[in-house]
């Protein structure tokens, strides 16, 4: 059921900073608030199927907990709802967003720093969309566009000015400049970069008073990391002699990855060299016309018993290497099995 009109909906959004979020977002809600956590993709990237968890345990939807693919709502929050919430990719269990949620006794309030309830007919400034101004933290992937807005009214029409980290903020303070639209009560920054992080305050004032709202901008950079391989891939395979087999390896990497498929072999009866390094033969590596997608699959046709053994997907980039391995078991064809049975021996798979 949707929250009733008397309930505040407090939104907190985090953008996916890549496969391993570097930090938890600390957020606080008031008792009785509707908590809304959202987790959005970077650079126009769909996240795929997701699940939400609290303190490591999967959340199940109920009349009070509404679970969506990129959004979680908890109605009428109480102290028991405090904890660490995470949004994870359903298949890889990769953590996409992390929130540390506190629930305080008092319902959270808007950022009206003068704290006085001034009647609208006095002409003092007031927010025209206060219910939409509670998303105080904006976490945005680098290169995207951000617009802060403080829609207001008053009589006479108030002026608006902007501060960054408490100091006057002007276009020349930023490479690429800013767009100030006084009629829209807005500040626009295109192609944000990490140096745009900070607190942005709109100050709306006329001769009868002043109100202000502070937004926090976090610009998410993907920290460089070695390739990440999807859990569970490649998977162990059992195949019949003469059949075809495919191993799959899913690679995530910001820096361009180099992917190889290796087969573990024995040399003079040993699987490892004197230094402990395994003996391998390279089955597949990047060529002039191979795409990443093609390299993520190793196809074995018409397998023989010699094909049985351990296979490794090795992915490297400028930061480092990652690898996952899987085993192939090759079973004899059914006719051979029957012949062996008649001879009285037992086959253990």
């Amino acid at each position: 059921e949707p929250p009733g009109p008397e309930q505040r909906v407090v939104r907190r959004a985090a953008e996916v900073p890549g496969p391993e979020p570097s930090q938890q977002e600390q957020v606080a809600f008031g008792s009785g608030d509707t908590v809304e956590l959202s987790c959005h993709p970077p650079g126009g990237a769909p996240t795929g199927p997701t699940v939400w968890a609290k303190d490591g345990t999967g959340l199940v939807a109920s009349h009070r907990i509404l679970v969506g693919p990129q959004r979680l709502q908890v109605l009428n929050a109480s102290h028991e709802d405090a904890g660490v919430y995470s949004c994870q990719h359903r298949l890889t269990r990769r953590v996409l967003c992390h929130f540390s949620v506190r629930v305080t006794d008092a319902p959270s309030s808007g950022d009206d720093e003068d704290g006085e309830d001034v009647a609208e007919d006095t002409g003092a400034p007031y927010w025209t969309r206060p219910e939409r101004m509670d998303k105080k933290l904006l976490a945005v992937p680098a290169a995207n566009t951000v617009r802060f807005r403080c829609p207001a009214a008053g009589n006479p029409t108030p002026s608006i000015s902007w501060l960054k980290n408490g100091k006057e903020f002007r276009g020349e303070h930023r490479i690429g400049g800013i767009k100030l639209r006084h009629q829209q009560w807005s500040l626009v920054m295109e192609s944000v970069v990490p140096s745009d992080r900070g607190n942005y305050t709109c100050v709306v004032e006329n001769k009868f008073g002043s109100i202000r709202q502070t937004y926090t901008l976090d610009v998410l950079e993907r920290s460089p990391h070695r390739p990440i391989l999807q859990a569970g891939l490649p998977a162990n395979q059992t195949a019949i002699l003469g059949s075809d087999v495919e191993f799959h390896c899913k690679v995530y990497s910001d820096a361009q990855p180099h992917i190889q498929w290796l087969k573990h072999v024995e040399v003079n009866g040993s699987k490892v060299g004197p230094d402990g390094t395994p003996y391998v033969t390279v089955l597949k590596t990047a060529g002039a016309n191979t795409t990443d997608k093609e390299l993520e699959v190793l196809s074995l046709h018409n397998v023989t018993f010699e094909d049985a053994g351990e296979y490794t997907c090795l992915a490297g980039n400028s930061i480092g290497f990652s690898h996952h391995s899987a085993w192939l078991v090759v079973l004899p064809a059914e006719e051979e099995l029957m012949e062996t049975d008649e001879a009285g021996s037992v086959y253990a798979g």
Epitope: G43, P46, A143, V146
Partner: antibody, heavy 126, light 109 residues
Framework: EVQLVQSGAEVKKPGASVKVSCKAS????????ISWVRQAPGQGLEWMGW????????NYAQKFQGRVTVTTDTSTSTAYMELRSLRSEDTAVYYC???????????????????WGQGTTVTVSS | QSVLTQPPSLSVAPGKTATFTCGGN??????VHWYRQKPGQAPVLVMY???ERPSGIPERMSGSNFGNTATLTITRVEAEDEADYYC???????????FGGGTKLTVLG
């Protein structure tokens, strides 16, 4: 200069497949998604689907589900759109476009397309 | 899924004002982007987040969005404004892009 350059015109028979490429330059490829939009002769723009250049995740319009595949190759900063089981109604200009995220403190997040390829004409005829 | 409605055509004399509308249920709760497409060319983004002009787009263009209608306005229309204009929203429920049917602007004379 930021640009998307698409592969050349194609003529295909009904039932065949077509694969259109879109090579990006002038920006960090993995920071923006790629959308595919088509336009039949004399008609409006029709969104087909999009792909994350970061992890390959995709999302397709219901109409094309199962018939279209959008992929990327980060080593060459190239996106691909393959459309299968072509019919005469698929005759159109196919565009790739860079997907940019817009984040608004009041309205939340929205995506738009700020840079477009020049278009690839695909003609399906027996 | 959002449905966006645009009138198919609009004719305006040079120097006058062209007003494009994009209708949709509670479209004012979403952010609208606008594209211009000249004959034989790819679309170009001319307005984003209802009211914001990308670099290189003249100040003659402005936008608004309220209730069930988003509007793109071009003042002092010139012959070079002749094109098709499309509105677009992002349907966050389905992660899908939705376009309006487009309006063809003809500059008279």
């Amino acid at each position: 200069e930021v640009q998307l350059v698409q592969s050349g015109a194609e003529v295909k028979k009904p039932g065949a497949s077509v694969k259109v490429s879109c090579k990006a330059s002038g920006y960090m490829f993995t920071s923006y998604g790629i959308s595919w939009v088509r336009q039949a002769p004399g008609q409006g723009l029709e969104w087909m689907g999009w792909v994350s250049t970061y992890n390959g995740d995709t999302n397709y319009a219901q109409k094309f589900q199962g018939r279209v595949t959008v992929t990327t190759d980060t080593s060459t900063s190239t996106a691909y759109m393959e459309l299968r089981s072509l019919r005469s109604e698929d005759t159109a200009v196919y565009y790739c476009a860079r997907v940019l995220g817009y984040y608004d403190s009041i309205d939340g997040y929205y995506y738009g397309m700020d840079v477009w390829g020049q278009g690839t004409t695909v003609t399906v005829s027996s | 899924q959002s449905v966006l409605t645009q009138p198919p055509s609009l004719s305006v004399a040079p120097g006058k004002t062209a007003t494009f509308t994009c209708g949709g249920n509670n479209i004012g709760d979403k952010s609208v982007h606008w594209y211009r497409q000249k004959p034989g060319q790819a679309p170009v983004l001319v307005m984003y987040l209802d009211t914001e002009r990308p670099s290189g787009i003249p100040e003659r263009m402005s936008g608004s969005n309220f209730g069930n209608t988003a509007t793109l306005t071009i003042t002092r229309v010139e012959a070079e404004d002749e094109a098709d204009y499309y509105c677009q929203v992002w349907d966050s429920g389905s992660d899908h892009v939705v376009f309006g049917g487009g309006t063809k602007l003809t500059v008279l004379g």
